[in-house]
Structures are given as C-alpha cells and as structure tokens.
C-alpha cells in the first residue's frame, strides 16, 4: 500500500538534486582556487541536514547554520551587486566585471541557484513530487528560508557603495515584496554602507523615459534615506551596449550615455 504523502502546491525537488549540488560544489571549488579546501561531501551533508526529516513548513535559519559555516568565503564588501527581477543580466555583468559579486557568484548562492528542494517530516526521503509554495502553503519552507538567510547575510556584509540592478520593464520597478525589497534593503548596515546606487535597466530600444523618476524608485529612495544611507539612480537605456562597454570600455561609442 503506497504511503500517504502530503501534496504541496509548488513543484517538487529538482530531479537529481543531490548529484547536482555535489557536482556544482566540485565545479565551484575547481574554478575558485581560494575555495579548493572545501570538502564538498561535508557541504552536501550539511545542506541535506538542513531539511531532511524536517517538516517542510517548519524550517528555520538555524537549520542552515552548519551549511553557512562551511560556505565561509571572502567577498569584497564594496563590490556587491544586488538585483531584483533581472538575474540574467546581473550575472552576465559579473561574468565580465569579475571583481563584482552577486549572491549567486558565491559558493552558497551558486549551489542553490534555480533549484527546488524539500523533505518530509520523520522520513529521510527527498520529496520529488511537490514542495510548499511560499504563498499558497507556507513561507518557512526550505527554499525560501535558505534564500532569506543568505540574502540577509549578503546584504549585511556589504559596505561603501552597493549597487542594485532593477528591471525597468516591470510594473513595479522596485517591489517591496521581492527578496531585495523585503530582506536586502532592510539589512544594509548604515554604519558600513554609504550609498545604494540603483541601475534601472530599460527594456524597449526606444524607451528614453527617466525611470529614476518612477514612483516605486522614489519609494525605494525614501526607505533608503530613512535608514541614513544615500541613494543614487542611473538609467541603463541600452543594456546590450552597457555590457559591451563593460567588456570594452575604451570603445569610442562608450563615452555617451548608455
């Protein structure tokens, strides 16, 4: 008789999740010599220990603490790039501008990027059928708690000028309910962070509006200013040209506004 299994509203654990995490860890430590001392089997064991045999609606930041310890890493605090709803461009940027880091450029972010995972209370099984949805089921699920934990700590680590890439094509360019709006903004440390600089990425080629005047950007400016952090904003009218100019800053076409 098949055992009754809780049906959640979200997709199940990514197939081959253990193998994927382990393989990503090995790849990351090979690419980043400063992380070659990391024992990837221990990393997987700590990751697994955070959610296996636990109710997937009752996960805490403390559950991930053993994994956090193993993911200790040097990140230049003044080279942090946050992003909201525009992950691909942010990652393309840091692949070119190698001295800047998104969360997914760190070991822990790299391990979990685009993956889903959850377990079941009192069994050692991974649930490949379904996992809790943040809205429909519960917010304290393994994936949401992981990203809230690492996002908070990433923001806390930031200093000097922090950059954030925002999607100018969205109805809410700044969304208070995004990870950036609900976690990272509120965990920037005013004694360490001087300025938050927003880069608003335009979608349409003929879009010449000043999206820095958007009401949601003004809302972000207000939140940041109240936290005693300065705010600045730049329109990136041509993201394709922006990336090209990061690659080739000497190009004559890169002196004009992008």
């Amino acid at each position: 008789v098949p055992r009754w299994r809780q049906q959640w509203s979200g997709p199940g654990t990514t197939k081959r999740f253990p193998e994927t995490v382990l393989a990503r860890c090995v790849k990351y430590t090979e690419i980043h010599p400063e992380m070659r001392h990391v024992d990837c089997q221990s990393v997987w064991d700590a990751f697994k220990g955070a959610f296996i045999s636990k109710h997937p609606c009752n996960i805490t930041e403390e559950d991930y603490q053993p994994l956090m310890k193993l993911g200790t890493q040097t990140v230049p605090c003044n080279k942090i790039l946050l992003w909201s709803r525009i992950k691909d461009l942010a990652h393309q940027f840091t692949q070119v501008q190698r001295d800047m880091f998104t969360l997914e450029d760190t070991l822990l972010g790299y391990l979990a990027d685009d993956l889903t995972w959850c377990g079941e209370f009192n069994t050692s099984k991974i649930n490949y059928q379904s996992c809790p949805d943040w809205r429909k089921d519960c917010s304290n699920n393994p994936v949401s708690v992981f990203w809230k934990t690492v996002s908070r700590r990433f923001a806390e680590a930031a200093c000097d000028v922090v950059h954030v890439m925002l999607n100018g094509s969205r109805s809410k360019i700044f969304d208070k309910n995004s990870t950036f709006g609900s976690v990272e903004v509120h965990n920037l440390q005013p004694e360490k962070v001087q300025t938050l600089e927003a880069w608003v990425i335009h979608g349409g080629r003929e879009d010449s509006r000043d999206l820095c005047q958007d009401p949601t950007i003004k809302e972000l400016e207000s939140i940041i200013s109240k936290r005693n952090i300065q705010f600045s904003c730049k329109n990136i009218y041509r993201p394709d040209k922006f990336l090209q100019c990061v690659k080739n800053p000497e190009d004559s076409s890169c002196t004009s506004e992008i």
Partner: nanobody, 117 residues
C-alpha cells in the same frame, strides 16, 4: 568606517594557550555580532567562532569546540578568543570580522598564530 586591529598571536608549543584580542572602531561595536575567521598557509578562509552583539550567544566550528572560547567586552569595543590545547593544525592568520558570515571582508591585518614544537 569599520576598523579592527588584531593582536595576541605568536609562536606556541602544541598543547599551549594564547589569547587573541581585536580592538574595533568606526562603528557601534555593541550592535554587531562578531566572528573570528582564520586562514592557514595555502588554504582558504575558515570560520572559527561567532558571538552575538550582547555576548549572550556563541558558536564554534567543530574543529575548535571545547578548546576555544570567544568573548567580548562592549565597554572596551574589544573581541577576544581564548585558545587552549592548541594543535599544529590551528596554525593560521586569525582575523576578526563584523557579522556572522558566511561572507567576510577582513578589515584588519590579522595576527599570526604558529603552533610548533
């Protein structure tokens, strides 16, 4: 600007003890959790121990649990690490850093601890 100055390192025999200090300035020390991290020669960064802003909560890497003790004196803006029963594998440069990690950017020069007979 966050500034820290670590001291107290040196050469010690296996089984010996050292007490590291970290003088912090440029930020409200009592508002921040703090950590000790270390880097052994040719190795990556390893988190050693952390302490809450009030000092009421502490945590340790498995490799140092029962041998190292982290503490702080908020009135002196100073973080401490008492290191007992030292082993050769504890040889490293020790840094103090604000926050609990896992992301660190050390602001000090660190203090070298060498455990050797």
């Amino acid at each position: 600007e966050v500034q820290v100055l670590e001291s107290g390192g040196g050469l010690v025999q296996p089984g010996g003890s050292l007490r590291l200090s970290c003088a912090a300035s440029g930020f409200t020390f009592s508002s921040y959790a703090m950590s000790w991290v270390r880097q052994a020669p040719g190795k990556g960064l390893e988190w050693v121990s952390g302490i809450s802003n009030s000092g009421g909560s502490t945590d340790y890497a498995d490799s140092v649990k029962g041998r190292f003790t982290i503490s702080r004196d908020n009135s002196k803006n100073t973080l401490y690490l008492q290191m007992d029963s030292l082993r050769a594998e504890d040889t490293a440069v020790y840094y103090c850093a604000d926050g609990t990690g896992p992301f660190f950017d050390y602001r000090g020069q660190g203090t070298l601890v060498t455990v050797s007979s």
